[in-house]
Amino acid sequence: EEELQMIQPEKLLLVTVGKTATLHCTVTSLLPVGPVLWFRGVGPGRELIYNQKEGHFPRVTTVSDLTKRNNMDFSIRISSITPADVGTYYCVKFRKGSPEDVEFKSGPGTEMALGAKPSAPVVLGPAARTTPEHTVSFTCESHGFSPRDITLKWFKNGNELSDFQTNVDPTGQSVAYSIRSTARVVLDPWDVRSQVICEVAHVTLQGDPLRGTANLSEAIRVPPTLEVTQQPMRVGNQVNVTCQVRKFYPQSLQLTWSENGNVCQRETASTLTENKDGTYNWTSWFLVNISDQRDDVVLTCQVKHDGQLAVSKRLALEVTVHQKDQSSDATP
C-alpha cells in the first residue's frame, strides 16, 4: 500500500458571503485507520472545524459518506459563509490510538478568502464624433471585485487590441478594487458597424468573463462625397439634375439646391438608402425649367452633414438651342 498523501487541490478558495464553500480533501490510501479532522490555522491555537468521529458541527456537511471504511474523500461544505470564516483550512489524518488519536499527516492547506465579482464593465466612447483615420479613446470601468488580480482585454470586431492603459485601484490592501482602462482605436471608414469590447476576467467568474461593449457608430462620422450630374433625357421643358450624396454617417443631413446662387424653396424628390457597411446614400433630383432659361445656369447642391460645415458641388447646366426649341415646341 502506498504511503498516505493528503490532497487539498486548491491553494486558494474564493467564497462569497452567505454562500456555501466546499473545501476539498482526498487521501491516496486507506491506511492507517483513523479519523480525518479539519482545522483552521496551525499550532496549538488551531480551531477545530470538523471531526468525523464526534462532535456537532451544524454548518458543516460532508460531500461523501465518511462512515465507510473505503471512503477516500473527506471534502466538506461550510454553509452561510461570513467574513469571520476566512483563513487557511487543513485536512488532517489521525491514526487510531489511545488515550487520544495521534496526528499522522496534514494536507497542505486551502486558504479561504472572500471574493467579490466585478461589476459588469461599462464602456464609454468619446463625447464627439471623429472621422476615419483619426484615433479615438474608449474607457472601460468595473468595480467592487476582490481579490485584486484581474485581467482586462480589449477587442475590436473580435481582434485583440494592444494600445491601451489599465489601472487597478487602490494599490494597497482593500476590501474591494476597481479597474479603469483606456484604449486608443484608429477609426476605419467601414467602422459604422464595428464594436469595441472590454473583457474582464476574474477568479470569481469561474472562467466566464464579463464583457462591456460600445458601438463605433456612436463615435464615428463618415463625411459624404458629392456628385452632381445632369440627366441626358429631359421631361417636357424640364431637365433632371441629380445630386448623389454617398457613404455618409450618421444619417443627419440637410440638402439644399441653389440656382445661380439663389436657394430654391421648391420641393425635390429624394431617396435614402443604407449601404452594407452601415453608411447611407442620399439621392436628390432637381427639375430645372429650361423654357425660359439662359445658357449660363449654375446649380449648386449643398449638404450640411451632422452639424458640420456645409460642402457643395456645382453644375453648369448645358441647355442647347435644340433643347430650347424642343422645350418651346413642347410648351402649349
Epitope: 500500500e1 486507506l30 491506511l31 485507520v33 483513523g34 479519523p35 468525523q52 468521529k53 464526534e54 465518511l66 462512515t67 465507510k68 471504511r69 473505503n70 471512503n71 487510531k96 490510538g97 489511545s98 488515550p99 487520544e100 488519536d101
Partner: antibody
C-alpha cells in the same frame, strides 16, 4: 446486497487442519479490512484474526503460529487456514467486515461450525 | 491485552423498560468501543461504533455513551425483539477484545 457467507467448517481430529472460506458480495472487497471471530457453544465472542487492505495480518496469542488468514481480492474471498487444531478451537467461526471508517465491524456472516474432537 | 468487563452479566426487564448496560475497559481506549446484539443461533448484529455512533439501520432507541474506560449502552423502551445477549468490544488496538456479554431476559 452486502453479504458474507462462510463455508468449510466440519469435524476434525485434534492436530488436524481445516480451511475456512468467506465469500463476499455486494461491496468492493479489496477496500475493507476483514476479520474472523469465533464463539464456543454457550460462550462469548473471541476475535481470531484480521487481514488489512494492504495484506497486513494480526492474531491473538491463542492462535498465533497455528492459524493463517489470507484474502484473494480477485475472487472476493477471505480464508482462514487452521493447523494444529485443538479441542479448545471448537466454535462457530464468523467472518466480519471492518466496514466503518474506524474498522468497527458492520457486517457479519452467518457462521460455520468447526468441531475438533477425537 | 485490554480486558473488557460488562455488567451486569444478566438482566431481567419488562416490555417498555429503559435499561442500561455498562462496559469497562482495563485501560483507556479513547472511544473505540462497539456494541453488538446476538440472538440464540444467530450471528451478532452491529449496533453502535465509536461509543455513540449508530450503525446504519439501527433504531434510535439504542444509544451509546462514554469515553476512556467507562461506557454504557441504553435501550430506551424494550420491545420483545430486544431480548438478547449484548457484547461490547474494544477495537483501538490488536488484539480486539470483547466483553463477556450481558444476557437481557424478559421478566
Amino acid at each position: 446486497e452486502v453479504q458474507l457467507v462462510e463455508s468449510g467448517g466440519g469435524l476434525v481430529q485434534p492436530g488436524g487442519s481445516l480451511r475456512l472460506s468467506c465469500a463476499a458480495s455486494g461491496f468492493t472487497f479489496s477496500s475493507y479490512d476483514m476479520h474472523w471471530v469465533r464463539q464456543a457453544t454457550g460462550k462469548g465472542l473471541e476475535w481470531v484474526s484480521v487481514i488489512g487492505i494492504a495484506g497486513d495480518t494480526y492474531y491473538p496469542g491463542s492462535v498465533k503460529g497455528r492459524f493463517t488468514i489470507s484474502r484473494e481480492n480477485a475472487k472476493n474471498s477471505l480464508y482462514l487456514q487452521m493447523n494444529s487444531l485443538r479441542v479448545g478451537d471448537t466454535a462457530v467461526y464468523y467472518c466480519a467486515r471492518g466496514g466503518s471508517w474506524d474498522d468497527a465491524f458492520d457486517i457479519w456472516g452467518q457462521g460455520t461450525m468447526v468441531t475438533v474432537s477425537s | 491485552d485490554i480486558q473488557m468487563t460488562q455488567s451486569p452479566s444478566s438482566l431481567s426487564a419488562s416490555i417498555g423498560d429503559k435499561v442500561t448496560i455498562t462496559c469497562r475497559a482495563s485501560q483507556d481506549i479513547n472511544n473505540y468501543l462497539a456494541w453488538f446484539q446476538q440472538k440464540p443461533g444467530k450471528a451478532p448484529k452491529s449496533l453502535i461504533y465509536t461509543a455513540s455512533s449508530l450503525q446504519s439501520g439501527v433504531p434510535s432507541k439504542f444509544s451509546g455513551s462514554g469515553s476512556g474506560t467507562d461506557f454504557t449502552l441504553t435501550i430506551s423502551s424494550l420491545q420483545p425483539e430486544d431480548f438478547a445477549t449484548y457484547y461490547c468490544q474494544q477495537y483501538v488496538s490488536y488484539p480486539y477484545t470483547f466483553g463477556q456479554g450481558t444476557k437481557l431476559e424478559i421478566k
